[in-house]
């Protein structure tokens, strides 16, 4: 019968007794930077080419006995998970292996850097089709390794890495913390985060998604027909590398940004039990388990968006946090969040010719996060329209006044330390969907975009009594681009998008003691692109 992990990543329409997805990734080459491998294992023989690259440190310990099967164990298993004939994800993908880990599974930053450079040079000398680089390794944070990953990613290579097995914030490790890399955490057959002894999968905002990573059957280097189960974020990353290979084989022109957005879009949502993660990491960690798209073609018409969290600002009074989108993505909205509720909002601002989302901490606050909504919107022309504090009783408002521009997001920021709890609520005039409304003492920022066929609408959900959380979701066929809270009298901690749902968090009612505080209203801006839909219909 089909191994659980292959069943889990397979959409229901493909499910059968055997795992036989429509395209095996035959146009893609996957580079594996790991241990040596047993290339004559029947699961991978003829599919994996062992390059002459080797850069590994000496094994520790004077009595270390170098046993071939042990040296090859990790790499052989991963090669099998990516492209193995029987238990592999992308059965058609060809692989090249580079040895950067020794027989004890240890490597160096310099060895990995030289390996990445070897791949870059190989790509220049002999350009092939799409390339996926699998980095099933994790070490301490390294600026230089992250920079090397960025260079390779900007050259059009898709890098997939393990989040790490330290039950810790993945942002503390490299290459997991590199924004350009697709970082993968591990889940088990019950869709729970993988525990490994006293440790387990890493988590946090640097993880892009999770994938099967416990009790994964794969080629064993013990013998030519041997199989073994292994666990960890390396195995999870291998699944995503395989899925990426299949997606790229079906659509070779996909950019890294497009691929990442598709991986996120087609993932299983909200299946992971977040209680496993530390409380402060739950909101930052994506609740996504990787899966193959239900069809390898035809996804191009959708407006894809993802949520990008910044690093924590830190608690100083003037601290700020910045969230950035990838180079090929558009920042369509910006929001902020603070656990203490003490924040001074957020704004979209230009930085290096690109819009970024900046959140501001407030005096006495424990710090803030900036949350960017990053979308794929071809031929988009976006700008930010700002209205300074109005001081008028009706509050501050700003709209998209340019012809053909639609509102995709609203932000507000203020200079006063604690805005909201003592101010009267602002009523927004109905029938003005292209308008952002805020407190009279706040600056309001509207993200206004023009793109072929782009249409957006505002959707609100208000709850009269105080609630810790208010949500509003976009319906099928529409994509959430903006998420904010209508200014009321309730103390809002912030707003953020989770998949296609806008979440507005308020201070715990039980701690405020009072239930007289006003309504909380979540405001979602939902968009779709008729242009993209028509284009895909023409292609079909």
């Amino acid at each position: 019968s089909i191994p659980w992990n292959l069943e889990r990543i397979t959409p229901p329409r493909y499910r059968a007794d055997e795992y036989q997805p429509p395209d095996g990734g035959s146009l893609v080459e996957v580079y594996l930077l790991d241990t040596s491998i047993q290339s004559d294992h029947r699961e991978i023989e003829g599919r994996v080419m062992v390059t002459d690259f080797e850069n590994v440190p000496e094994e520790d310990g004077t009595r270390f006995h170098r046993q071939a099967s042990k040296c090859d164990s990790h790499g052989t298993h991963l090669a099998g998970v990516v492209s193995g004939r029987d238990a592999g994800v992308a059965k058609g993908a060809s692989m090249r292996s580079l040895r950067v880990l020794n027989c004890q599974g240890k490597g160096t930053v310099s060895g990995t850097l030289i390996g990445l450079e070897f791949i870059r040079k190989s790509q220049l000398v002999q350009p092939v089709g799409p390339l996926v680089v699998l980095l099933p390794l994790a070490g301490g944070y390294s600026r230089v390794l992250n920079a090397a990953c960025q260079r390779l990613a900007r050259a059009g290579v898709v890098l997939v890495t393990a989040a790490g097995n330290f039950r810790d914030d993945a942002c503390l490790y490299s290459p997991a913390s590199a924004p350009e890399v697709i970082t993968v955490g591990a889940t088990n057959a019950q869709d729970q985060p993988v525990t490994l002894g006293t440790l387990g999968t890493n988590f946090g905002r640097c993880v892009d998604l999770f994938a099967p990573g416990e009790d994964i059957i794969g080629a064993s280097s013990d013998c030519s027909t041997c199989f073994v189960s292994q666990s960890g974020t390396s195995q999870a990353a291998a699944h995503v590398a395989g899925i990426a290979a299949m997606m790229l084989s079906a659509e070779p022109e996909l950019t890294l940004a497009e691929l990442r957005q598709r991986l996120i879009h087609f993932s299983a949502k909200d299946v992971i039990n977040e209680a496993w993660f530390p409380e402060d990491q739950r909101v930052l960690t994506p609740n996504l388990v990787a899966a193959l798209p239900p069809s390898t073609h035809g996804a191009g018409w959708q407006l894809f968006c993802r949520t990008v969290w910044s690093a924590h600002s830190g608690p100083t009074r003037m601290a700020t946090a910045v969230a950035r989108c990838a180079p090929d993505e558009e920042l369509l909205s910006c929001s902020s969040f603070s656990r203490s509720g003490k924040r001074r909002g957020e704004r979209m601002e230009a930085q290096g010719g690109k819009l970024v989302c900046r959140a501001h901490n407030a005096f006495g606050g424990e710090g803030v996060y900036a949350i960017a909504r990053c979308c794929l919107l071809p031929q988009a022309n976006c700008s930010v329209h700002t209205a300074p504090p109005a001081e008028a009783s009706m509050g501050t408002r700003v709209h998209c006044h340019q012809q053909g521009h639609v509102l995709t997001g609203c932000s507000s920021h203020w200079e006063v330390e604690d805005l909201g709890t003592h101010k009267p609520p602002v009523l927004r005039p109905r029938g003005q969907p292209n308008q952002c409304v805020g407190h009279r003492e706040a600056s309001i920022h509207a993200s206004c975009c023009h793109a072929p066929g782009l249409e957006c609408k505002v959707k609100e959900h208000g709850i009269p009594a105080p609630q810790e959380q208010v949500t509003v979701a976009c319906e099928e066929g529409w994509t959430l681009t903006g998420c904010s809270a209508l200014p009321g009298t309730s103390h809002v901690l912030g707003a953020y998008a989770v998949d296609n749902t806008c979440v507005v968090r308020s201070r715990d009612v039980s701690t405020t003691g009072s239930t007289s505080e006003g309504a909380v209203t979540a405001v979602a801006i939902c968009c779709r692109s008729r242009h993209l839909a028509q284009a895909s219909q023409e292609l079909q």
């Epitope: 004939r85 064993s220 013990d222 030519s224 041997c226």
Partner: antibody, heavy 119, light 113 residues
Framework: QVQLVQSGAEVKKPGESLKISCKGS????????ISWVRQMPGKGLEWMGL????????RYNPSFQGQVTISADKSISTAYLQWSSLKASDTAMYYC????????????WGQGTLVTVSS | DIVMTQSPDSLAVSLGERATINCRSS????????????LAWYQQKPGQPPKLLIY???TRESGVPDRFSGSGSGTDFTLTISSLQAEDVAVYYC?????????FGQGTKVEIK
């Protein structure tokens, strides 16, 4: 039910070519390996090689490398064993058998094809 | 290549008596990663293809009578027929399936005394 059905007995002259077949049914043919095993008259079993019909990967016993060719046509769930130039010493019963990655032993066997090479 | 050696070459046992066949491999077929012995036993009756009896050295294939059992580990293995029946007259082969080329023992012929 799961079965492997082999082509009928063959009588050939030395130097002639031959291709015998093994058709799988009742299971996903592309996901299992097919091995070929020789049994010379009154002798034991000798593994000749295998094929994975999913991608036509083959592995040969060095003793048979270059002597025979193993192939498959997954569209008709059939594996083949062929000789370009038969010798009298190729006279034997030839069996096909299947195995799976998690069960890498031969659990289902064909009924055998008797090949007789005589001038 | 891993060489498989069976003993004895032939064996005559009375009906209802125990028959024991040994098989030795030239190198271990036990692998630490999954703690499995990559060894199988087959039965071949005259004019028929071989039939799988035992795999992983000691796991009986479904439908095989429980009088057949396998034991051993590493390099030394045994097939036991606890109470020989008339229909058990056949040639028995051990096989290692861990390394290429896959190899069989030379076979042991079991007859009724």
């Amino acid at each position: 039910q799961v079965q492997l059905v082999q082509s009928g007995a063959e009588v050939k002259k030395p130097g002639e070519s031959l291709k015998i077949s093994c058709k799988g049914s009742g299971y996903s043919f592309t996901n299992y390996y097919i091995s070929w095993v020789r049994q010379m008259p009154g002798k034991g079993l000798e593994w000749m090689g295998l094929i994975y019909p999913g991608d036509s990967y083959t592995r040969y016993n060095p003793s048979f490398q270059g002597q025979v060719t193993i192939s498959a046509d997954k569209s008709i769930s059939t594996a083949y064993l062929q000789w370009s130039s038969l010798k009298a010493s190729d006279t034997a019963m030839y069996y096909c058998a299947r195995d799976y990655y998690s069960r890498p032993f031969s659990d289902i066997w064909g009924q055998g094809t008797l090949v007789t090479v005589s001038s | 290549d891993i060489v498989m050696t069976q003993s004895p070459d032939s064996l005559a046992v009375s009906l209802g008596e125990r028959a024991t066949i040994n098989c030795r491999s030239s190198q271990s077929v036990l692998y630490s990663s999954n703690n499995k012995n990559y060894l199988a036993w087959y039965q071949q009756k005259p004019g028929q293809p071989p039939k799988l009896l035992i795999y992983w050295a000691s796991t009986r294939e479904s439908g095989v009578p429980d009088r057949f059992s396998g034991s051993g580990s590493g390099t030394d293995f045994t097939l036991t027929i606890s109470s020989l029946q008339a229909e058990d007259v056949a040639v028995y082969y051990c096989q290692q399936y861990s390394s290429f080329p896959i190899t069989f023992g030379q076979g042991t012929k079991v007859e009724i005394k």
